[in-house]
Amino acid sequence: SETTTGTSSNSSQSTSNSGLAPNPTNATTKAAG
């Protein structure tokens, strides 16, 4: 069976098994203060 790894969001292949979101958000940062 074929391994499913981190694939692009426009691919038909699922990204779930890679453990990574298909288009991860950039982590929000709080301003120092």
Partner: antibody
């Protein structure tokens, strides 16, 4: 069977360069994002870089600490991913792994940056 | 960056007992597709990490069902029931929802 086999690594002086390579087999490489992760006693596990697919125009992402110094690239015809590291610093020392995501990991290769 | 905090740092258990490891993130790991990209890895000394669990609770192939992942949002747990000698090593959680992906500091499981 999925295999990720690395080459490269070793001892390099601060300010120097090193290129790591990783050859993949056992899965459809052209459909897979590829990543480099490093590990050190001081910082633990640290995601370094990611490269996406041809259909994504080989988009890349880097952790802030390596931006402008490291370049991830891939050659789909060779099922290979590379990490070119320039202007190396002592804090870049560690074991470098190539990974498909969180699921498959190479054996790791050690980079030591020291004078 | 999303801060991932694991506790305890070291866990000393008797063979046959249950071990529990906590992983907390500074931001929710729930992605817009309804999935939560929280993974658990295991590493023995001198070896590369091996994934045990993905999407909070899904066991990888070959991982015994003694391992259970649970949680949601920012709070996650790995439970190892009936601990065996082969379970000793370091366990890491890693989030794949936000870039840069970030790891917990690890929990070393020791056998009493």
């Amino acid at each position: 069977e999925v295999k990720l086999e690395e080459s490269g690594g070793g001892l390099v002086q601060p300010g120097g360069s090193m290129k790591l390579s990783c050859v993949a087999s056992g899965f459809t490489f052209t459909n897979s994002w590829m990543n480099w992760v490093r590990q050190s006693p001081e910082r633990g596990l640290d995601w370094v870089a990611q490269i996406q697919l041809k259909s994504d125009n080989y988009a890349t992402r880097y952790v802030e600490s390596v931006k402008g110094r490291f370049t991830i690239s891939r050659d789909d015809s060779k099922n290979s991913v590379y990490l070119q590291m320039n202007n190396l610093r002592a804090e870049d020392t560690g074991i470098y792994y190539c990974t498909t995501g969180t699921d498959y990991w190479s054996q790791g290769t050690t980079l030591t940056v020291s004078s | 960056d999303v801060v991932v905090t694991q506790t305890p740092l070291t866990l000393s258990v008797t063979i046959g007992q249950t071990a529990s490891i906590s992983c907390k993130s500074s931001q929710s790991l729930l992605f817009s597709n309804g999935k939560t990209y929280l993974n658990w890895l295991f590493q023995r000394p001198g070896q590369s990490p091996k994934r045990l669990i993905y999407l909070v609770s899904n066991l990888d192939s070959g991982v015994p069902d003694r391992f259970t992942g649970s949680g949601s949002g920012t709070d996650f747990t790995l439970k190892i029931s009936r601990v065996e000698a082969e379970d000793l090593g370091v366990y890491y959680c890693v989030q794949g929802t936000h870039f840069p992906y970030t790891f917990g500091g690890g929990t070393k499981l020791e056998i009493k």
